[in-house]
């Protein structure tokens, strides 16, 4: 999977879309998930209604939002008032028994709130030594991780 | 109806090719995915492998991974499984059987089968 | 993998008897169950998925009960069509997994 890079503000809201197939994903609950580290697992955030038919219905966990348009084959989630601490990758998930399909890499860059005149020196951008003058960016937010970009800061 | 119908018993000799094929009528055949199921003479059924004709994302049982290839060409609504060198012990009735999801709780189950195939490998 | 394991092996029973054959999984499938019956020659009918929810056109008398290891499927009253093999299949992960098998025959 190649992986999405989605940009908000930081005390902004910002809205992630993954698009799938609608038959292929039939029947199946979604979900939002937080890779925690390159190779480790990927720690859900939220999931859609426990009912598939009302996957249309926002649920929230915390600051985050999940809803599914099931015919239309979309997911989206909203992250309200984005903080630093947000920015990292995270996935899509498709939902089948015990198992979850991975429908999108995302990887989400809190940008400085250019109003805001603290500070900015602890916001992370992964891969900010990149240069990302010809990357693709979808809705102004967000483009396709370029190829050797990493989407994880350097550990000591 | 909903049907499945499988191609005819096949007699074949250790090492030889072999492509066996299931093809759907009555539904969408793109929108379901379609597996494979081994059964041994009196014995049970081996889960093998499914694939979702749509795009032909496809996964194994580790047991069979490297062993079968699982294909489908959506134009003719058909799936098929092949062996590149049979073994004696490839010998088993092979059943192709539609997956359907359930939205009552996210899991798929097979709700359709085809009357299966009889493979018989001996030299 | 999981391991799914059917007691008995084979039953006995006669027409008009209530029959319970139990399917374990070697770890927790939530209610990710299903069950199939076998007629000689034949392929495999569903009869029960999501451990309890009975397929269409399955007549009352098969249910289905329990989640996580340990699963139950019942016929209240044995029809003479009903003697067959069934087997139990979780559908919690890759690669899905079948009971051995259990073979319901004539007393």
């Known amino acids: 999977h190649n992986t999405t890079v989605f940009q908000g503000v930081a005390g902004q809201s910002l809205q992630v879309s993954c698009p799938y197939d609608s038959m292929k994903h039939w029947g199946r609950r979604k979900a939002w998930c937080r890779q925690l580290g390159e190779k480790g697992p990927c720690q859900r955030v939220v999931s859609t209604h426990n009912l598939w038919l009302l996957s249309f219905l926002r649920r929230w966990n915390g600051s985050t939002a999940i809803t599914d348009d099931t015919l239309g084959g979309t997911l989206t989630i909203t992250l309200r008032n984005l903080q630093p601490h947000d920015a990292g990758l995270y996935q899509c998930q498709s939902l089948h028994g015990s198992e979850a399909d991975t429908l999108r890499k995302v990887l989400v860059e809190v940008l400085a709130d250019p109003l805001d005149h603290r500070d900015a020196g602890d916001l992370w951008f992964p891969g900010e030594s990149e240069s990302f003058e010809d990357a693709h960016v979808e809705h102004s937010i967000s483009r396709s991780l370029l190829e050797g970009e990493i989407p994880f800061p350097p550990t000591s | 109806e909903v049907q499945l119908v499988q191609s005819g018993a096949e007699v074949k000799k250790p090492g030889e090719s072999l492509k066996i094929s299931c093809k759907g009528s009555g539904y969408s055949f793109t929108s379901y995915w379609l597996a494979w199921v081994r059964q041994m003479p009196g014995k049970g059924l081996e889960w093998m492998g499914i694939i979702y004709p749509g795009d032909s994302d496809t996964r194994y049982s580790p047991s069979f991974q490297g062993q079968v290839t699982i294909s489908a060409d959506k134009s003719i609504s058909t799936a098929y499984l092949q062996w590149s060198s049979l073994k004696a012990s490839d010998t088993a009735m092979y059943f192709c059987?539609?997956?359907?999801?359930?939205?009552?709780?996210?899991?798929?189950?097979?709700?359709?089968w085809g009357q299966g195939t009889l493979v018989t490998v001996s030299s | 993998d999981i391991q799914m394991t059917q007691s008995p092996s084979s039953v006995s029973a006669s027409v008009g008897d209530r029959v319970t054959i139990t399917c374990r999984a070697s770890q927790g499938i939530s209610s990710w169950l299903a069950w199939y019956q076998q007629k000689p020659g034949k392929a495999p009918k569903l009869l029960i998925y999501a451990a309890s929810s009975r397929q269409n056109g399955v007549p009352s008398r098969f249910s289905g009960s329990g989640s996580g290891t340990d699963f139950t499927l019942t016929i209240s009253s044995l029809q003479p069509e009903d003697f067959a093999t069934y087997f139990c299949q979780q559908a919690d992960s890759y690669p899905r997994t079948f009971g051995q098998g259990t073979k319901l025959e004539i007393k």
């Open positions: 059987a539609r997956s359907r999801t359930f939205y009552y709780d996210s899991s798929d189950y097979f709700d359709y």
